[in-house]
């Protein structure tokens, strides 16, 4: 496989990882599928200082990160553990709101204007942040 | 100049098997997604699939999930379309066509002449 | 999947004419909207992509806006050269989709 040594154009180097924030909305599963068709993930929030990072760059407006529990337990998109990683959960969420009327809970994890996180609907057509390691080997699958 | 020229079209049985393939040239091949458009008279224009530009995302339409694979050689310029299984409703031209990522989506630009698959007993 | 319509399916114009072509998506989106135009025996081309911005290369005659689930393509004065079929694609969300076209021949 290739690795990626640089950033792409109009991303933004920070701490070994590219980030690409957008400025306009799509569902969760439509944002995550922009991102892994560019070879990267909706972002991972691993540290504090990584929140405040991402936080500076999206502004007070909600925004998708790669955080869902739409299959039961909370998940992050790229494997990292959700049980013993960082998290900045508003007070009292996440809720599973069912009270919205759109059908279902809220299965998918966003910034909210104040940086914290919230569950929502995934359909909600909400920015987002894709993220991709530096130095990490492709998966570029053997051709048969 | 961006130039992509597929091959490998022609008349297959149905439940028969066929490989086509993309020469890209002009561009950094691996920073770019690409993908398959079908055409038929019928149907019009179909999406079909879409690979990362590391080939490790792929993505299907349901029509073609679990009988097409979407692939590439980077080291050689090479998008490929392998098809198996094939049915008469996938008599189409093919186009392969590079996806460019501006504006939180993906734009198809520039195509490729297009080659002809035809399913047929 | 997200449907996409055209109207008209056709429409017969003369050189120097305004044209206005309306696509509409079956769920509303953003401006996440492409138009192709396509000569007989071609491929597509890319006119316009995120709904209103001009691809590089394509004449200023050429106009897209909308948001949501109404779109437009507007040739502003028809040439020669742009007697073709045109087409949306929805690129919101997999399967991204098209419209089944619209036919501009000469009046």
């Known amino acids: 496989g290739s690795e990626r040594t640089c950033c792409p154009v109009n991303w933004v180097e920070h701490e070994r990882s590219c980030y690409w924030f957008s400025r306009s909305g799509k569902a969760w599963a439509d944002a995550d599928n922009y991102c892994r068709l560019e070879d990267a993930h909706l972002v991972v929030v691993t540290s504090w200082e990584e929140q405040k990072f991402v936080q500076h760059h999206i502004g007070p407006v909600n925004t998708w990160m790669g955080l869902h529990d739409q299959n039961g337990p909370w998940k992050w998109v790229d494997g990292t553990d959700y049980e013993t990683g960082f998290k900045n959960w508003r007070p009292e969420q996440p809720d599973d709101w069912y009270g919205h009327g759109l059908g279902g809970g809220e299965d998918c994890a966003h910034f909210t204007d104040d940086g914290r996180w919230n569950d929502d609907v995934c359909q909600r057509p909400y920015r987002w942040v894709c993220e991709t390691e530096l130095d990490k080997a492709s998966q570029e699958p053997p051709l048969l | 100049e961006v130039q992509l020229l597929e091959s490998g079209g022609g008349l297959v049985q149905p439940g028969g098997s066929l490989r086509l393939s993309c020469a890209a040239s002009?561009?950094?091949?691996?920073?770019?997604?690409m993908t398959w458009v079908r055409q038929t008279p019928g149907k019009g224009l179909e999406w079909v699939s879409a690979?990362?530009?590391?080939?490790?995302?792929?993505f299907y339409a349901d029509s073609v999930k679990g009988r097409f694979t979407i692939s590439r050689d980077n080291s050689e310029n090479t998008l490929y379309l392998q098809m198996n299984s094939l049915r008469a409703e996938d008599t189409a031209v093919y186009y392969c066509?590079?996806?460019?990522?501006?504006?939180?989506?993906?734009?198809?630009?520039?195509w490729g002449q297009g080659t002809l698959v035809t399913v047929s007993s | 999947d997200i449907q996409m319509t055209q109207s008209p399916s056709s429409v017969s114009a003369s050189v120097g004419d305004r044209v206005t072509i309306t696509c509409r998506a079956s769920?509303?989106?953003?401006?996440?909207l492409a138009w192709f135009q396509q000569k007989p025996g071609k491929a597509p081309k890319l006119l316009i992509y995120?709904?209103?911005s001009l691809q590089d290369g394509v004449p200023s005659r050429f106009s897209g806006s909308g948001s949501g689930t109404d779109f437009t393509l507007t040739i502003s004065s028809l040439q020669p050269e742009d007697f073709a079929t045109y087409y949306c694609?929805?690129?919101?969300?997999?399967?991204?989709?098209f419209g089944p076209g619209t036919k501009v021949d000469i009046k």
């Open positions: 769920q509303g989106f953003s401006t996440w």
């Open positions: 995120a709904a209103s």
């Open positions: 002009g561009f950094t091949f691996s920073s770019y997604a």
């Open positions: 066509a590079k996806a460019r990522a501006v504006a939180g989506s993906h734009w198809f630009d520039p």
């Open positions: 690979i990362s530009g590391s080939g490790g995302n792929s």
């Open positions: 694609q929805q690129t919101n969300s997999f399967p991204f989709t």
